[in-house]
């Protein structure tokens, strides 16, 4: 019967007695930077080309017994997971292996860099179809390794890496922390994060998504027909590399940004038990398990968005945090979050010719996060409209006044230390969807975009008194672009998007002693693109 | 994911290029930085990736590497250029004593230097 991991990533329409999705990634080449491999294994024979690249440190210890089967173990298994005949994800993908890890599974940053450079030179000498690079390795945070990954990604290569097996924040490791790389954590057959003894899968905002990574059946280097089960974030990354190969084979023109958004969009949502993660990491860690799209074409009409969290600002009075979108993405909204509730809001601002989302800490605050909503919006022209604090009136307002521009997000930023001591504003008057409303002492920022066929609407859900969390979701066919809270009083910890749901967190009234008149409203801006939908229908 | 100024140990050596009367001294006020792995057991001292500024050509990378070797030799230090990078990042990989880091950070075109470190199969 089909192994659990292949069943997990397969949409129901393909599920039969065996895993046979259409097009096995035949147009794509997957580079594997790992240990040596047993290329004559029946699973991968004829599918993997062993390059002459080798850059590994000497093995530790004086009594090390170098056995080919042990040296090849990790790489052979991963090659099998990506493209193995029987247990592989992308059975049609061809692979090339580079040896950057020694027989003990140890390598160096410099050896990995030289390997990445080798791939870039190969790509220049002999351009082929789409390239996927699988990096099933991790070391401590490395500026240079992250920079090399960024350069390779900007050359059109899709890089997929293991989040790391340290039960730790993936942002402390490389290449997992490189923003341009697709970073994969590991889950098991119960959709729980993988535990590896005391350690386990890494987590946090640097993880893009999770994939099967426990008891994964794959090629064993013990013999040419042997199979073995292995666990780890390497195995999880290999699944995503395989899924990426299949998506790129179906749509070879997909950019990295488009591929990442599709991987997120087609993932299983909210199936991971977040209690396994440290409390402060739960909100930052994506609750996504990778899966193949239900069909290889026809996703183009979707307006794809994802949520990007910044690093923590730190606790100093003037500390700020910045969240950035990828170069091909549009920043459609910006929000902020603070566990202590002490923050001074957020604003969208230009940096290096691109909009970024900046959140501001407040005096006595433990720090803030900036949360960017990053979307794929072709031919978009977006700008930020700002209204300074209204001071005297009931609230500050700003709207999109340019012809054809629609409101995609609202942000507010204030200089006073605690808005909670000031009178909260009235709620937005109905029937004014292109307007942001905020506290009279705050400056309000509206993200206004013009794009072919783009339409947006505002959806609100309010409750009379704060109860920890208020949510509002966009309905089927609409995509959440903006998420904010009304009012901006001190008991509101912040707002952020989780998939297509806007979440506003506040302190519970029982702990703050707030009065019931202080309503909290979650405000979602939901958009869709008629242009993308029409273009997709014309293709079919 | 992680910003470039992210969570890792950074030892910044702010240096002016006075020594050796460098012909192509970096602009006044610019400083190259030194980085190393925050996890001590994974550090590999003695091997360094010297990363040069973005638009540096291969010939300039080779010249900078040779200049480092020459200046190190004048101080009685042996160095070995293990690899010259081009195609992804301009720079070179050098085996040398950590005592030479100050000197290397003053070289023209240097953006930053990172001590080599271990990576592991996951």
């Amino acid at each position: 019967s089909i192994p659990w991991n292949l069943e997990r990533i397969t949409p129901p329409r393909y599920r039969a007695d065996e895993y046979q999705p259409p097009d096995g990634g035949s147009l794509v080449e997957v580079y594997l930077l790992d240990t040596s491999i047993q290329s004559d294994h029946r699973e991968i024979e004829g599918r993997v080309m062993v390059t002459d690249f080798e850059n590994v440190p000497e093995e530790d210890g004086t009594r090390f017994h170098r056995q080919a089967s042990k040296c090849d173990s990790h790489g052979t298994h991963l090659a099998g997971v990506v493209s193995g005949r029987d247990a592989g994800v992308a059975k049609g993908a061809s692979m090339r292996s580079l040896r950057v890890l020694n027989c003990q599974g140890k390598g160096t940053v410099s050896g990995t860099l030289i390997g990445l450079e080798f791939i870039r030179k190969s790509q220049l000498v002999q351009p082929v179809g789409p390239l996927v690079v699988l990096l099933p390795l991790a070391g401590g945070y490395s500026r240079v390794l992250n920079a090399a990954c960024q350069r390779l990604a900007r050359a059109g290569v899709v890089l997929v890496t293991a989040a790391g097996n340290f039960r730790d924040d993936a942002c402390l490791y490389s290449p997992a922390s490189a923003p341009e790389v697709i970073t994969v954590g590991a889950t098991n057959a119960q959709d729980q994060p993988v535990t590896l003894g005391t350690l386990g899968t890494n987590f946090g905002r640097c993880v893009d998504l999770f994939a099967p990574g426990e008891d994964i059946i794959g090629a064993s280097s013990d013999c040419s027909t042997c199979f073995v089960s292995q666990s780890g974030t390497s195995q999880a990354a290999a699944h995503v590399a395989g899924i990426a190969a299949m998506m790129l084979s179906a749509e070879p023109e997909l950019t990295l940004a488009e591929l990442r958004q599709r991987l997120i969009h087609f993932s299983a949502k909210d199936v991971i038990n977040e209690a396994w993660f440290p409390e402060d990491q739960r909100v930052l860690t994506p609750n996504l398990v990778a899966a193949l799209p239900p069909s290889t074409h026809g996703a183009g009409w979707q307006l794809f968005c994802r949520t990007v969290w910044s690093a923590h600002s730190g606790p100093t009075r003037m500390a700020t945090a910045i969240a950035r979108c990828a170069p091909d993405e549009e920043l459609l909204s910006c929000s902020s979050f603070s566990r202590s509730g002490k923050r001074r809001g957020e604003r969208m601002e230009a940096q290096g010719g691109k909009l970024v989302c900046r959140a501001h800490n407040a005096f006595g605050g433990e720090g803030v996060y900036a949360i960017a909503r990053c979307c794929l919006l072709p031919q978009a022209n977006c700008s930020v409209h700002t209204a300074p604090p209204a001071e005297a009136s009931m609230g500050t307002r700003v709207h999109c006044h340019q012809q054809g521009h629609v409101l995609t997000g609202c942000s507010s930023h204030w200089e006073v230390e605690d808005l909670g001591t000031h009178k909260p504003p009235v709620l937005r008057p109905r029937g004014q969807p292109n307007q942001c409303v905020g506290h009279r002492e705050a400056s309000i920022h509206a993200s206004c975009c013009h794009a072919p066929g783009l339409e947006c609407k505002v959806k609100e859900h309010g409750i009379p008194a704060p109860q920890g969390q208020v949510t509002v979701a966009c309905e089927e066919g609409w995509t959440l672009t903006g998420c904010s809270a009304l009012p901006g009083t001190s008991h509101v910890l912040g707002a952020y998007a989780v998939d297509n749901t806007c979440v506003v967190r506040s302190r519970d009234v029982s702990t703050t002693g707030s009065t019931s008149e202080e309503a909290v409203t979650a405000v979602a801006i939901c958009c869709r693109s008629r242009h993308l939908a029409q273009a997709s229908q014309e293709l079919q | 994911q992680e910003d470039e100024d992210g969570d890792y140990e950074e030892l910044v050596l702010a240096l002016r290029s006075e020594e050796d009367g460098l012909a192509e001294a970096p602009e006044h006020g610019t400083t190259a930085t030194f980085h190393r792995c925050a996890k001590d057991p994974w550090r590999l001292p003695g091997t360094y990736v010297v990363v040069l500024k973005e638009e540096t050509h291969l010939s300039q990378s080779e010249r900078t590497a040779r200049r480092l070797q020459a200046q190190a030799a004048r101080r009685g230090y042996l160095t070995k250029i293990l690899h010259v990078f081009h195609g992804l990042l301009p720079g070179f990989l050098v085996k040398m004593s950590g005592d030479l880091l100050e000197l290397a950070l003053k070289l023209p075109h240097v953006d930053y230097i990172e001590e080599d470190s271990s990576v592991f199969a996951q």
Epitope: G61, K70, G105, N165, G197, L199, S231 | -
Partner: antibody, heavy 122, light 111 residues
């Protein structure tokens, strides 16, 4: 439930041999390095030996080098310690312990057995 | 003769804080991960801290670890009678290619 159970201890004369076993259950044995640690009566912990997850490498304390051999049978989920040329100072409770990870052997030990007593006496 | 030195004993009243030092060299603590172990009377050792300052699940946050140079420290806050035990630091020693334990510290809770 993760379990390590040592066996094979007993009273033995100096110069003789003894083989200790450690049966592992509740985890994927072949994914972890394994240690032997001992504790003489009223004394502190003393590390004895380590074997890598796949059996490809072994390390020993100087005090037992050449006399003790660590080995494992991954198909039986069992760790062994062959002790030859035993001395009075080898008298101790012997614990087997799991390394925190396969590759990062310097991380220490996270699961311990209850120990088996070895007494070397004439 | 252990290469890691710990104080033989420390004591404090319930609710107080104690710290245990572990002194080594660049070949062990200076360049390798430090773990701390608790051994209650008559039982096997138990892992408290690994990677200098990380706690396995189930270990309360009253236990903390830190490292500075070639020394490591274990801190126990809110001392409880159940904390009476021997505590050992441990790390790999690159020069010896061996794992080394500290001399051990007995923690006594004063009544």
């Amino acid at each position: 439930q993760v379990h390590l159970v040592e066996s094979g201890g007993g009273v033995v004369q100096p110069g003789r041999s003894l083989r200790l076993s450690c049966a592992a259950s509740g985890f994927t044995f072949n994914s972890f390095g394994m240690h032997w640690v001992r504790q003489a009566p009223g004394k502190g912990l003393e590390w004895v030996a380590l074997i890598w997850s796949d059996g490809s490498d072994e390390y020993y304390a100087d005090s037992v080098k050449g006399r003790f051999t660590i080995s494992r049978d991954n198909s039986k989920n069992t760790l062994y310690l062959q002790m030859n040329s035993l001395r009075a100072e080898d008298t101790a409770v012997y614990y087997c312990a799991r390394a925190i990870a396969a590759l990062y052997y310097y991380y220490g030990m996270d699961v311990w057995g209850q120990g088996t007593t070895v007494t070397v006496s004439s | 003769q252990s290469v890691l030195t710990q104080p033989p004993s420390v004591s404090a009243a319930p609710g107080q804080k104690v710290t245990i030092s572990c002194s080594g060299s660049s070949s062990n603590i200076g360049n390798n991960f430090v773990s701390w172990y608790q051994q209650l009377p008559g039982t096997a050792p138990k892992l408290l801290i690994y990677d200098y300052n990380k706690r396995p699940s189930g270990i309360p946050d009253r236990f903390s670890g830190s490292k500075s140079g070639t020394s490591a420290t274990l801190g126990i806050t809110g001392l409880q009678t159940g904390d009476e035990a021997d505590y050992y630091c441990g790390t790999w020693d690159s020069s010896l290619s061996a794992y080394v334990f500290g001399t051990g510290t007995r923690v006594t809770v004063l009544q």
